[in-house]
């Protein structure tokens, strides 16, 4: 069944004399492998012989016989799939029909392929997009229905005969669907390319010309314009006339409308190719161009900058920055409309001309207080001198200056007084808004910059104030010099360094911590009696009678201060010892008799010893010697001895008389 043979290959192949043909081909024979293959040139079926007649270009049989033509024609296929053929070189007379006679064990098939061989290399074909617009990227395609492995070729692009700089992308196809060589060129045409000739040139491997195709570019573009101005430099003075002419150098398609623009805005009622400006004013200075439109869009000429020259206008001053802090940098800028630009500037401060600066900008690196004020300027160019416009104010700010703390009170200030201080300053910008005081205290501020200290302390030494605007300036501290009575008056023993013993030399000092004023007087007192007026109280030989409570007083012009009472203690051995008897020195036997050792001692007696008339010490050591019951034998003279840490003392003899009781007398 012949319908079972399926072939795929290009319908027609193109080549030229001396080139080659590569015929990509696939087939499918469903009843088994190919046993015989014959390539005919222009085959014709012979009904009589039931065979095909024609030139056999290639023959492959079981016996393997191959005609001599086989060297030029090659079957590159196989027995079941591939039927690719190559003819190299190909000749003009190879044109026509190629017949592939295929035979399998049971089936036969004739497949026809058209071959078109030209005498000379045929030209490629340039394909262009339907419309080309300036600056829009397009792809130019050059297509040649030829490709063969044995015959390399190249396609080159030329613009007006000159190779194009843009890189082309060449691709080849040798498939059962198509055989071609293609070159694609991406290209952004400009308006100047309109009407230019583009060529695609076919060359052999050595670059030898084979054939070409040419097209003329039709680049759609907005009108291209040239503007001409009289005078040519476009510099005029007020009152002069100016003519501008617009010329169209190219337009595709043809232009339709004309207009004129100044600084990008259309001028009304100006729709011709000539613009006449009569008696120009400075307001007519600006950038002029003409605009011509076509179907693509509007085209604009280059701008002509028309300069209408005039003397400077009244100037204004810009200050960067005001207010300015003293010591900071400031820049003054003189702004004045003028053409040509001013060449010289005169600066004014508070209406007076300032020398030394003739520039548009004046830069002061570190501003000073006298720079404050109103600044104005005058600009000058070749056409004249402008007028002084309104001034700009420079405000120079600084901390309060020459701040002083002032005591409002009459001097001297005494402890306990109410003191009023004021904080004064010389100048300030901005104004002082608050004050600070050192040291801090629970003090009153009855009004801004005034401090009231109620009941001023003796130790309030110095006060400083600060006047503050955006910054605080501190005054030097002011001494209050508060006067007060002597403080911390106390009695201090200078000598002896240890405890005072009777007979010692003793010095007491009247001390105080401070006094203002410094001049003081001293007073010593004992039990309300004035003892001395020196800072020291001296005893050459102290006696127990000097012991007691001492006070010293220190006074100055403000007042007097007493010390705490200070007890003077004199240590001495027991003295003035005597033995006292109770109930008396005559006691009846049987009764009770108490002998007491009385003494004066400092420190008190710590140890007592009793003696009888024989100077025999008795075994008693307390202050009291109790005899109970008393006997007549107890009669006699007694004495005692007292001992303390300082020494010993003894009493004189005291006689105890014990008399008989009536009972004893009665018994006798």
């Amino acid at each position: 069944d012949s319908s079972k043979w399926v072939f795929e290959h290009p319908e027609t192949l193109y080549a030229w004399e001396g080139a080659c043909v590569w015929i990509p081909c696939t087939y499918r024979a469903l009843d088994g492998d190919l046993e015989s293959f014959i390539l005919f040139h222009n085959p014709e079926y012979n009904k009589n012989t039931s065979k095909f007649d024609g030139t056999r270009l290639y023959e492959s049989t079981k016996d393997g016989k191959v005609p001599s033509e086989q060297k030029r024609v090659q079957f590159l296929g196989d027995k079941n799939k591939n039927c690719t053929l190559s003819i190299h070189p190909v000749h003009l007379n190879d044109s026509g029909q190629l017949g592939l006679r295929m035979e399998s064990k049971t089936e036969k098939w004739m497949e026809r392929i058209h071959l078109n061989v030209s005498e000379r290399p045929f030209p490629p074909h340039i394909q262009l997009p339907p419309e080309i617009q300036e600056s829009q990227e397009v792809t130019l395609t050059c297509l040649l229905n030829f490709s063969c492995y044995g015959y390399p070729i190249q396609l080159q692009w030329l613009l007006e005969g000159v190779p194009m700089r843009q890189a082309a992308v060449t691709s080849t196809s040798l498939t059962i669907k198509s055989v071609f060589t293609r070159s694609e060129l991406k290209f952004s045409p400009q308006w100047s390319h309109h009407g230019k000739i583009v060529t695609c040139q076919l060359q052999d491997a050595d670059g030898k010309f084979l054939s070409n195709d040419t097209v003329q570019l039709n680049v759609k573009h907005t009108p291209k314009l040239e503007i001409k101005v009289t005078p040519s430099d476009a510099i005029v003075r007020e009152g002069d006339s100016v003519t501008m002419t617009c010329e169209v150098s190219s337009s595709n398609p043809e232009y339709t409308t004309v207009s004129w623009l100044k600084d990008g805005t259309s001028l009304k009622k100006q729709n011709t190719f000539t613009l006449n400006l009569r008696e120009v004013t400075k307001d007519q200075s600006g950038k002029y161009c003409c605009q011509v439109s076509n179907d693509v869009g509007p085209g604009r000429s280059e701008e002509v900058f028309l300069q209408v020259q005039y003397a400077p206008e009244p100037s204004t001053v810009q200050i960067l920055h005001s207010p300015a802090v003293e010591g900071s940098q400031v820049e003054f800028l003189c702004m004045s409309l003028a053409n040509p630009l001013p060449t010289n500037y005169t600066w004014y401060h508070n209406g007076k001309e300032m020398q030394g600066r003739t520039e548009e900008k004046v830069h002061i690196p570190k501003i000073l207080p006298w720079h404050a004020g109103t600044y104005s300027c005058v600009a000058e160019n070749i056409l004249g001198t402008g007028q002084r416009g309104p001034g700009a104010e420079l405000d120079v700010q600084y901390p309060p200056k020459k701040v002083t703390t002032v005591i409002q009170n009459p001097m001297p200030i005494r402890e306990g007084d109410t003191v009023t201080l004021s904080c004064n300053y010389n100048s300030s910008n901005p104004s002082v808004t608050r004050y600070e005081w050192k040291p801090h205290g629970a003090w009153e501020e009855p009004s801004l910059g005034v401090l009231k200290i109620q009941n001023v302390g003796w130790d309030n030494t110095t006060i400083a104030c600060a006047a503050c605007n955006s910054w605080c300036s501190w005054a030097s501290p002011v001494a209050l010099n508060v006067q007060y009575a002597p403080r911390d008056v106390r009695v201090r023993k200078i000598k002896p360094l240890s405890e005072i013993h009777s007979g010692n030399s003793v010095s007491l000092q009247c001390d105080f911590s401070s006094s203002h004023p410094k001049e003081v007087q001293f007073f010593w007192e004992k039990n309300g009696r004035l003892l001395g007026k020196e800072s020291q109280l001296n005893f050459d030989s102290i006696s127990p009678e000097d012991a007691g409570s001492y006070s010293c007083w220190v006074n100055n012009s403000i007042g007097q201060t007493a010390s705490k009472a200070w007890t003077l203690e004199v240590l001495y051995a027991p003295r003035r010892l005597r033995v006292s008897m109770s109930p008396g020195d005559q006691v009846m036997e049987g009764k009770s008799a108490t002998l007491t050792c009385e003494s004066d001692a400092n420190p008190p007696v710590s140890h007592y010893t009793w003696f009888d008339w024989n100077n025999q010490s008795l075994p008693y050591h307390s202050q009291k010697l109790r005899l109970e019951p008393v006997k007549v034998q107890h009669s006699g003279a007694y004495w005692c001895q007292g001992t303390n840490s300082v020494g010993k003392g003894r009493s004189p003899l005291s006689t105890l008389t014990v008399y008989y009781s009536p009972e004893t007398i009665g018994r006798r």
Epitope: E326, G327, H349, N350, K352, E353, M354, Q355, G356, R357, V362, I364, P365, K366, L368, P369, W370, H371, Y398, P399, K401, K402, N426, S427, S473
Partner: antibody, heavy 117, light 108 residues
Framework: EVQLVESGGGLVKPGGSLRLSCAAS????????MSWIRQAPGKGLEWVSY????????YYADSVKGRFTISRDNAKNSLYLQMNSLRAEDTAVYYC????????????WGQGTLVTV | SYVLTQPPSVSVAPGKTATITCGGT??????VHWYQQKPGQAPVLAIY???DRPSGIPERFSGSNSGNTATLTISRVEAGDEADYFC???????????FGGGTKLTVL
């Protein structure tokens, strides 16, 4: 050419008075701030007083405040320094000086006049 | 009040560089001007605005000012540069001009 010429110096007893003058030429006197600066023999420079172009702003050194008075007569292109209650320590060469408004520097100095107290 | 401290004297060989300092608290925030005074003559402005040169002053004279020190530098010193040099600032706290004590430049 800028010129500043001082006059009025001389010998004076302590407590006495002197008036120094400075004649300015070669520039627009009324546009400039002016100063008096002194130099005691063998010593450094000491600023004395300063006056703005219109005379509205005046500064004095603490050492002369209350005793010296600076003034100017723009019509006569003249600067003055009235010195009262003169002291031995006021003995110096007194320079008349032109101030540059912008920088505050002294751009021109006179040759000075000697005051001996 | 504001105090400017200058070294009493500076000595330099001809052709070398002389550096004269002027010390003051935060002097960098103030305009410093320098004056040259030759014996028996009035002072002459040498540098203003810290580092600007008036016309007529050679390029060898330069100034700088930052922190607590302003400096006058004289490069390639010549015999004719021998003079007293004074620095000057405006003390804004007291509204006074203040001069340094002066530096005697000796060219060896």
């Amino acid at each position: 050419e800028v010129q500043l010429v001082e006059s009025g110096g001389g010998l004076v007893k302590p407590g006495g008075s002197l008036r120094l003058s400075c004649a300015a030429s070669g520039f627009t006197f009324s546009d400039y701030y002016m100063s008096w600066i002194r130099q005691a023999p063998g010593k450094g420079l000491e600023w004395v007083s300063y006056i703005s172009s219109s005379g509205s702003t005046i500064y004095y050194a603490d050492s002369v405040k209350g005793r010296f008075t600076i003034s100017r007569d723009n019509a006569k292109n003249s600067l003055y320094l009235q010195m009262n209650s003169l002291r031995a320590e006021d003995t110096a060469v007194y320079y008349c000086a032109r101030d540059d408004f912008w920088s505050g520097s002294v751009d021109y100095w006179g040759q000075g006049t000697l005051v001996t107290v | 009040s504001y105090v400017l401290t200058q070294p009493p004297s500076v000595s330099v060989a001809p052709g070398k560089t002389a550096t004269i300092t002027c010390g003051g608290t935060n002097i960098g925030s103030k305009n410093v001007h320098w004056y040259q005074q030759k014996p028996g003559q009035a002072p002459v402005l040498a540098i203003y605005y810290d580092s600007d040169r008036p016309s007529g002053i050679p390029e060898r004279f330069s100034g700088s000012n930052s922190g607590n020190t302003a400096t006058l530098t004289i490069s390639r010193v010549e015999a004719g540069d021998e003079a007293d040099y004074f620095c000057q600032v405006w003390d804004s706290s007291s509204d006074h001009w203040v001069f340094g004590g002066g530096t005697k430049l000796t060219v060896l």
